[in-house]
């Protein structure tokens, strides 16, 4: 559900939205820390119905909905974080 | 007080449309996600589908993508499911419910009254 | 997709009995867990959220409990008003119900 992404493209979020989304409707959590070409970090959602948001990384839905699912991920196995580098 | 009350259910042949809608009152509509949910006669419940905010962003269950949409207008406080090419499988009593607001916890917990669609020749 | 198994499907018991219904759930839904009573040609009514809750209004003789895959609703002590169909929801990755438990007087 979690991704943190490291990569060096340039931003991929046009705009943002801080809309809260339920998680049942959401199929996983992009992160892209700021940084290689992009002075921000990013988060992209995935939602159950094949669309694609970027999520202002600064709405407090977003942020307790990760620290939920880091906790989960550091004591369950249902929910992992998948760490990938591109070069 | 909150309420909900579903109109527009009767009976289709199959292959018909039909458009429910439901009347919300009593805590401010904008502010929920909603949702459609129906039960077949001597059944269980069924998830249907559901929709956000401002009706940007709708979900449904796998056998009525393509021919069910949910819509919503906040003016009018109104829920609508658009029901197309009905199956006699459809036959059901829908309900339409508020479904989450910022916190969850109002999941599934007002309910309409419900209105009876009938798919038969 | 979730699948959410419940059990039993009928159940007969009698005025204040302590009653038991089972949910188990496909894979793990993180307690994300309602039920429902339903009484014939009325909607659903919520009775507990996130497992173990208490909807406002709701008698303290019915309890939720339960993590991971498996999760229960209890009634303490059966009363009158309590026999009708009672339901799970899972609300952890979209919905599903499960598909009822008829409780019966005996």
């Known amino acids: 559900v979690l991704e943190v992404y490291y990569t060096s493209l340039r931003c991929r979020c046009v705009q943002e939205s801080s809309v809260f989304i339920p998680r049942r409707f959401i199929d996983r959590i992009q992160i892209l820390p700021r940084g290689n070409g992009c002075p921000r970090k990013e988060i992209i959602v995935w939602k159950k119905n094949k669309s694609i948001v970027c999520v202002d990384p600064q709405a407090e839905w977003i942020q307790r909905m990760m620290e939920v699912l880091r906790k989960r991920s550091s004591s369950t196995l249902p929910v992992p974080v998948f760490k990938r580098k591109i070069p | 007080e909150v309420q909900l009350v579903e109109s527009g259910g009767g009976l289709v042949q199959p292959g018909g449309s039909l458009r429910l809608s439901c009347a919300v009152s009593?805590?401010?509509?904008?502010?929920?996600?909603m949702a459609w949910v129906r039960q077949a006669p001597g059944k269980g419940l069924e998830w249907v589908a559901s929709?956000?905010?401002?009706?940007?962003?709708?979900y449904y269950r796998d056998s009525v993508k393509g021919r069910f949409t949910v819509s919503r207008d906040n003016a009018k406080n109104s829920l609508y499911l658009q029901m197309n090419s009905l199956r006699a499988e459809d036959t059901a009593v829908y309900y339409c419910?508020?479904?989450?607001?910022?916190?969850?916890?109002?999941?599934?917990?007002?309910w309409g009254q419900g209105a009876l669609v009938t798919v038969s020749s | 997709d979730i699948q959410m198994t419940q059990s039993p499907s009928s159940l007969s018991a009698s005025v204040g009995d302590r009653v038991t219904i089972t949910c188990k759930a496909s894979?793990?839904?993180?307690?994300?867990l309602t039920w429902y009573q339903q009484k014939p040609g009325k909607a659903p009514k919520r009775l507990i959220y996130?497992?173990?809750i208490l909807q406002t209004g709701i008698p303290s003789r019915f309890s939720g409990s339960g993590s991971g895959t498996e999760y229960t609703l209890t009634i303490s002590s059966l009363q009158p008003e309590d026999f009708a169909t009672y339901f799970c929801?899972?609300?952890?990755?979209?919905?599903?119900f499960g598909q009822g438990t008829k409780l019966e007087i005996k």
């Open positions: 419910a508020t479904e989450e607001d910022y916190d969850g916890s109002y999941v599934m917990d007002a």
């Open positions: 009593g805590f401010t509509f904008s502010d929920y996600y």
């Open positions: 929709i956000n905010y401002d009706g940007g962003d709708t």
């Open positions: 894979q793990n839904i993180n307690k994300e």
């Open positions: 996130n497992t173990n």
């Open positions: 929801l899972q609300q952890s990755s979209l919905y599903t």
